[in-house]
Interface confidence: medium
């Protein structure tokens, strides 16, 4: 056969035979089937879970379908001695407890094994001291308390609310301040929309929710005992004070009535300005301490959480590939949920699962895709990416020589507003395409594609009648993938509006009152939304592993690279002085990107033109694609984050969930002004310099003709 | 003392080419950015043309790019614009000067310049 | 590309008077602006850079300021040999272009 024929293509056999297969009313069904019952990782009910799903794909008509396991650190609350925060007096009295758990949504009051609000892998520690309101505990805000207000957080217990950046750069910084303990709260200015109630009334957070969540430091490590390998039957696992990413202070989440109590007595300093106020009845004082009448009381924590090794399983299908089925693509999304995984994981588990079934009809009917398929079911991404982390380091020499994509599929929606996409520039020009021909789900643009309400609602900062897409990031199981590996990436979902919600992700994020009802009754009623992420992740995915050329766009990297210089060009700009005199200059990296660009447009030529009958000819192209996001890849890695190795995109080493460009120059610059030795810190600047242009200019002779 | 000294000017008929040199002392001549500027009679400062320290990257005007070619060799300290299809309006002193810098991105300033050599492009 | 907008073109002045000269780029450049001094055939010579470093050996009269859109080039107290045209220059990025020039003639 040619390579034309291999894959059976009939018109039935097609894309759109793939999407009309997609059903929202399967989808619906798929939730309710997860989300009856908590999937906490290293429970015995993910573990069935994983064998539900294992079952049913093999059902579905995967090739095959195994469970991987791994044996990883993870955090517990202790079930006969719980966690909690208190105000004592002068006599160390307790005079007010936090509260121990959340009062369980209607119809949820009977299920056991809720697991109580906790942040996983707090050290166990009774602290006691004066507290400081430390706004968001971004690197800013800890400028402003030590650098223009004078307070030192040395030996305090830091309160910071949740939102704008992952909560263990919270503590990272809070650690670096000096405090002993930080306790994190939701504000109601963050997870509490104006005219929305609260659940079960409608979507926002009542005053007793509280948000779960890991608060390690790992930078991409995966198991803290394993960093690198992974944590199989013969691992050698290092000593829990050499463990990756582990906070060293008490850490414990509560909601904003507890919060109320904590808040109202703050003395010290008022609030430098209105952005450290949030929206409780309270003075949002900074401290320290609390004011005149209550100034003898003082904050205690009591956290006794352990952590302890716990097999976790995922779950690998495998859809084999009739003509390249060395080459591999990757749809993978976590199992494990804090409590029930409504959203987050449940509604993008859901999506999967119905892909999974849609593409076994195609096959049940003599359809295989050109390339293979994989199937993923991630567990232990709550407690910091482990389980694709762990299957990623198993398997590194087969994914960075095989693998062609990786797309997400976590949580299918944090709104209902608009499609939300981040994703390598490679696959820029196949998200546009496929959105022109999928239908648009949003009231007021019927009949027309998603392409065109996704631009109307979305637009693209940088140019008109196109769509924003955003940068990868982390905070899911993406990360190995792509920071790690190079693996060209891409995750959607249904967004909110954000210009009209400021509150951060969606109020009840990692709560008890994450369950089916909230999507069933406020977020996709006919799973509309649902659906639509199913078509994008699945068309996308379809694509990549059916196209004879795979659908990279190797310009759309030369346009961003030339942004990002300019960017990074302006930030080291506000420092002419330094720059004269240490002598840098972007000319190496300005002259890559333009490199770059000219070979990029060549490679683009060659690519319309080629003989694709050629298998031969065919397959080294493909591989000159394939191989482009891997050539972004600094086997050394960036300063002090080793597994961080992508030289374009990292996540902010101030925020794991945000994305940054030439990361390991950003980071060189970063508060250079402070720096005590500015002529270490400007050739550091240069060095990083160096390395982008470097990388760059090889990344762009990867798509140089062969010979 | 730190000099450049241009030279190759001179009356050429429009189409034709020139090449003009600019030879440096009393400094590192690898360690510059260099460029060329001109100036027309009565009329301002115009930037025609600029090298990095090590001729890895270059840069021109628009209104001389694909006709002219800036390059050095660090090896005789000498600075070269090659000009060709000239035009009336290419008529100016042409200016060799030194960056106080290794690149163009940025530069501070053009710290050395020559004496300047005519061309004048007329039929 | 950046143009340079220089202002006044020319401007007449005495002897002690206190001179200033502005110069606005079309988008922000930091503080990436040069000022030069040029007498009629001769070479320019640079007096200031990244808009408020006096280059050495020129005299402390002349001082620079500015940063993103609006740089200033100050003459505190005219002498004799200032009398010159005066052109304003961005090196924030390629083409580093020159503005229009103020000549500073004796009123």
């Known amino acids: 056969k040619s390579s034309n024929e291999a894959t059976n293509i009939t018109p039935k056999h097609n894309m759109k035979a793939f999407l009309d297969e997609l059903k929202a009313e399967n989808i619906k069904k798929f939730l309710y089937n997860f989300t009856q019952i908590p999937h906490l990782a290293g429970t015995e009910q993910n573990f069935q879970l994983a064998k539900q799903i294992q079952s049913q794909w093999k059902e579905f008509g995967l090739d095959s379908v195994e469970l991987a396991h791994y044996d990883v650190l993870l955090s517990y609350p202790n079930k006969t001695h719980p966690n909690y925060i208190s105000i004592i007096n002068e006599d160390g009295n307790e005079i007010f407890n936090t509260s121990l758990f959340e009062p369980p949504p209607p119809g949820y009051e009977n299920v056991s094994d809720i697991v109580p609000p906790f942040s996983a892998f707090s050290p166990q520690g009774m602290p006691e001291g004066d507290l400081v309101y430390v706004n968001y505990a971004r690197t800013e805000d800890f400028f402003k308390l030590e650098r223009d207000m004078k307070i030192n957080c040395s030996g305090k217990i830091v309160i910071a609310r949740y939102g704008k950046v992952f909560r263990g750069n919270k503590v990272k910084n809070a650690q670096l301040a000096g405090a002993k303990g930080v306790i994190l709260y939701s504000d109601p200015a963050d997870y509490f929309a104006p005219g929305v109630k609260s659940y079960p009334d409608g979507w926002n957070l009542p005053g007793g929710g509280v948000q779960r969540g890991n608060i390690l430091n790992l930078n991409g490590a995966g198991d803290p005992l394993t960093p690198g390998y992974p944590a199989n039957e013969y691992a050698y696992r290092r000593g829990i004070a050499e463990a990756v990413g582990l906070p060293s202070i008490p850490v414990h989440p509560i909601g904003y009535y507890d919060a109320q109590k904590l808040l109202e007595k703050m003395g010290g300093s008022a609030p430098p300005d209105s952005s450290w106020r949030g929206s409780l009845k309270v003075p949002y004082n900074v401290g320290p301490g609390f004011t005149g009448n209550f100034s003898t009381q003082k904050v205690k924590m009591h956290i006794h959480s352990t952590n302890e090794v716990t097999r976790i399983y995922n779950v690998i299908g495998t859809l084999r590939g009739a003509v390249e089925p060395d080459r591999y693509v990757i749809l993978g999304g976590h199992r494990d949920s804090w409590v029930f995984g409504g959203i987050d994981p449940q509604s993008g588990a859901a999506v999967v699962h119905e892909i999974v079934r849609s593409f076994g009809t195609l096959k049940k009917e003599g359809w295989r895709p050109r390339r293979t398929i994989l199937f993923a079911s991630w567990d232990a991404e709550e407690f910091g990416l482990l389980g694709s982390t762990e299957w990623a380091e198993e398997n590194s020499r087969l994914l960075q020589e095989r693998g062609v994509a990786y797309i997400n599929a976590d949580s299918s929606i944090e709104g209902n507003y608009t499609l939300r996409v981040d994703c390598t520039p490679l696959m820029y020009s196949l998200v546009h395409n496929l959105t022109k021909e999928l239908k648009s789900p949003d009231e007021g643009f019927e009949g027309k594609s998603l392409y065109e309400s996704w631009t109307k609602k979305s637009p693209s900062p940088e140019f008109s009648g196109m769509p924003r897409i955003s940068k990868l990031g982390s905070g899911n199981d993406f990360e190995v993938f792509f920071q790690r590996l190079g693996i060209a990436s891409g995750r959607a979902r249904y967004t909110k509006n954000w210009e009209t919600n400021k509150f951060s992700g969606y109020p009840l994020y990692h709560s008890v009152y994450e369950t089916y009802e909230l999507v069933e009754k406020f977020y996709d009623p006919m799973f509309k939304y649902h659906l639509t992420v199913a078509q994008v992740r699945g068309g996308m995915v379809f694509e990549l592993a059916n196209s004879i050329v795979l659908p990279f766009d190797c310009r759309d990297y030369a346009v961003v690279l030339r942004k990002y210089a300019d960017k990074i060009y302006s930030i080291s700009m506000k420092h002419p002085q330094e720059m004269k005199t240490y002598s840098v200059s972007f000319d190496s990296l300005f002259s890559a990107v333009k490199n770059f660009t000219e070979i990029a447009s060549k490679f683009s030529e060659r690519l319309q033109d080629f003989d694709k009958s050629n298998p031969i000819v065919l397959r080294m192209m493909n591989d000159q694609l394939m191989f482009l996001e891997r050539a972004f890849i600094d086997p050394l890695g960036l300063p002090d984050r080793p597994f961080y190795r992508h030289v374009i995109y990292a996540p902010s080493s101030h925020n794991k969930y945000a994305g940054e460009s030439f990361p390991g120059i950003y980071d060189a610059l970063f508060d250079i002004e402070s720096k005590v030795d500015p002529s270490k810190a400007w050739g550091e600047v240069k060095r990083q310099i160096y390395v982008a242009a470097f990388t760059v200019q090889a990344a762009a002779e990867t798509l140089s003709e062969v010979a | 003392e730190v000099q450049l000294l241009e030279s190759g000017g001179g009356l050429v008929q429009p189409g034709g080419s020139l090449r003009l040199s600019c030879a440096a002392s009393g400094f590192t001549f690898s360690s510059h950015a260099m460029s060329w500027v001109r100036q027309a009679p009565g009329k301002g400062l115009e930037w025609v043309s600029g090298i990095t320290a090590s001729g890895g990257s270059t840069y021109y005007a628009d209104s001389v790019k694909g006709r002219f070619t800036i390059s050095r060799d660090n090896s005789k300290n000498t600075l070269y614009l090659q000009m060709n299809s000239l035009r009336a309006e290419d008529t100016a002193v042409y200016y060799c000067?030194?960056?106080?810098?290794?690149?163009?991105?940025?530069?501070?300033?053009?710290?050395?310049w020559g004496q300047g050599t005519l061309v004048t492009v007329s039929s | 590309d950046i143009q340079m907008t220089q202002s006044p073109s020319s401007l007449s002045a005495s002897v002690g008077d206190r001179v200033t000269i502005t110069c606005r780029a079309s988008q922000s450049i930091s503080t990436f602006v040069n000022w030069y001094q040029q007498k009629p055939g001769k070479a320019p010579k640079l007096l200031i850079y990244?808009?408020?470093t006096l280059q050495t050996g020129v005299p402390s009269r002349f001082s620079g300021s500015g940063s993103g859109t609006d740089f200033t080039l100050t003459i505190s107290s005219l002498q004799p040999e200032d009398f010159a045209t005066y052109y304003c220059?961005?090196?924030?990025?390629?083409?580093?272009?020159f503005g229009g020039g103020t000549k500073v003639e004796i009123k």
């Open positions: 990244a808009a408020s």
């Open positions: 000067a030194r960056d106080d810098s290794s690149g163009y991105y940025p530069s501070y300033g053009m710290d050395v």
């Open positions: 220059q961005q090196t924030y990025s390629p083409p580093p272009d």
